[in-house]
Interface confidence: medium
């Protein structure tokens, strides 16, 4: 029986050009986490295998960093990064737990409002 629950950072927003940490946490189970997959829609961003380590997809290597922990750091954000992200925990003996995070990347407030705050 699967007793665990996934806690995530939920719906989050970040500025274009900035970075964000995607975090999930599996609790209320003693199951062994064998692997965590991070996916955006149907694209694989990264895996963290308990024994074989972290592996980042080549197309994201420049902008994705492993950690902290089993989380994932996205850097140099663009508006195209807006969307759903999934952490998929493969565990033994429970099975698979999935968490969802929605990221909205906003235009930089400095770029939008900078002209209003010029010092005379």
């Amino acid at each position: 029986m699967m007793t665990g629950t996934i806690e995530t950072t939920g719906n989050i927003s970040a500025e274009k050009g900035g970075s964000i940490i995607l975090q999930c946490h599996l609790s209320s189970t003693t199951a062994q986490v064998t692997q965590v997959n991070w996916e955006q829609q149907d694209q694989l961003l990264a895996i963290c295998n308990a024994d074989l380590g972290w592996h980042i997809s080549p197309s994201f290597k420049d902008r994705v960093a492993p950690g902290p922990g089993l989380g994932l750091t996205l850097q140099s954000l663009t508006v195209n990064d807006t969307g759903e992200y999934f952490c998929i925990y493969h565990t033994y003996p429970d099975g698979t737990y999935t968490g969802r995070i929605f990221l909205e990347v906003l235009e930089s407030s400095v770029a939008e409002h900078g002209a209003r705050f010029q010092i005379p």
Partner: nanobody
Framework: EVQLVESGGGLVQPGGSLRLSCAAS????????MGWFRQAPGKEREFVAV??????????TYADSVKGRFTISADNSKNTAYLQMNSLKPEDTAVYYC???????????WGQGTLVTVSS
Amino acid sequence: EVQLVESGGGLVQPGGSLRLSCAASGRNFRRNSMGWFRQAPGKEREFVAVITRSGGGEVTTYADSVKGRFTISADNSKNTAYLQMNSLKPEDTAVYYCAMSSVTRGSSDWGQGTLVTVSS
């Protein structure tokens, strides 16, 4: 110590198929995760596919570049893992390595690699 021996590499024409094998030998070996990785000339080693325990069975994860073309599998009775590679492309040319982790040791072992060349 677990010894891993890969085989099945060779020269194949674009669109062709190959099946790689990775045999593990070692006392009381019980696999937790098994992965295939590759390294093309002048490039970093990259993740190809992994099979790991989840629930009462196993799950597979693939790099986007091989999804739908490659299939990872394992024969636990023979302590052997396989990578079936179909619709091969010149960009699949690389040395392919397998890695396995032992549940009892909690660390991974790597094979020496087998060269796959896709060329007409």
